[in-house]
Amino acid sequence: TIPPHVQKSVNNDMIVTDNNGAVKFPQLCKFCDVRFSTCDNQKSCMSNCSITSICEKPQEVCVAVWRKNDENITLETVCHDPKLPYHDFILEDAASPKCIMKEKKKPGETFFMCSCSSDECNDNIIFSEEYNTSNPDLLLVIFQ
């Protein structure tokens, strides 16, 4: 497994280890910052972001932010630490493998945000209600 001389050095904020000594590679996320988007009135959309980045820190997760105002629609894709708010909102769904969009209250625009923790999971953003875990039927399926 991990050589002992390496293991001694892994206790810093850039490294996450498990009980078996495995080391977590940082998340791979789509990272195009803010781009104009054509994603509108769809159950799900692809980010159309061609840049996949290795997140800077292993605790970071993938985030997508969809915004619509009178002038345009934008989609933001980034890595972010779920311990810290993003756009003043807590990343409640950071452990989710899928990026399920949740609407947030922002004056003057429609604002949706999602976060997730599987590789490149912010490439496919999901608006459809059928994925929403507040749906009791879905919860039944998940926990069966």
Epitope: D18, N20, A22, V23, K24, F25, Q27, L28
Partner: nanobody
Framework: EVQLLESGGGLVQPGGSLRLSCAAS????????MAWVRQAPGKGLEWVSR????????YYADSVKGRFTISRDNSKNTLYLQMNSLRAEDTAVYYC????????????WGQGTLVTVSS
């Protein structure tokens, strides 16, 4: 038993090139993601690059993007790291590592090969 054996390190001048190899055995190499990680003297680990099992999708840390190229030859069970335009700050021990289950957790590491960039 899983074994990873790195080679190809050495002393090189700034601006020079090196090609690291990692010979893998004890597992089905073609089924696992692989990565290169480095540790500079007195510093922590830094992830350098990762390659998917199919060899097509590759990922790089910003510090090496455009200079380093990761590749693999699944028929030879070997992982490579081509390092060009080397800088003093690339001086480190370079390790190859094997993904546990395509989930970003790397459970087996080689013993490392030292790359020294100095004039």
């Amino acid at each position: 038993e899983v074994q990873l054996l790195e080679s190809g390190g050495g002393l090189v001048q700034p601006g020079g090139s090196l090609r690291l190899s990692c010979a893998a055995s004890g597992f089905t190499f073609s089924e696992y993601d692989m990565a290169w990680v480095r540790q500079a003297p007195g510093k922590g680990l830094e992830w350098v690059s990762r390659i998917r099992s199919d060899g097509v999708r590759t990922y790089y840390a910003d510090s090496v993007k455009g200079r380093f190229t990761i590749s693999r030859d699944n028929s030879k069970n070997t992982l490579y790291l081509q390092m060009n335009s080397l800088r003093a700050e690339d001086t480190a021990v370079y390790y190859c590592a094997k993904d546990r289950a395509k989930n970003g957790w790397f459970d087996y590491w080689g013993q490392g090969t030292l790359v020294t960039v100095s004039s």
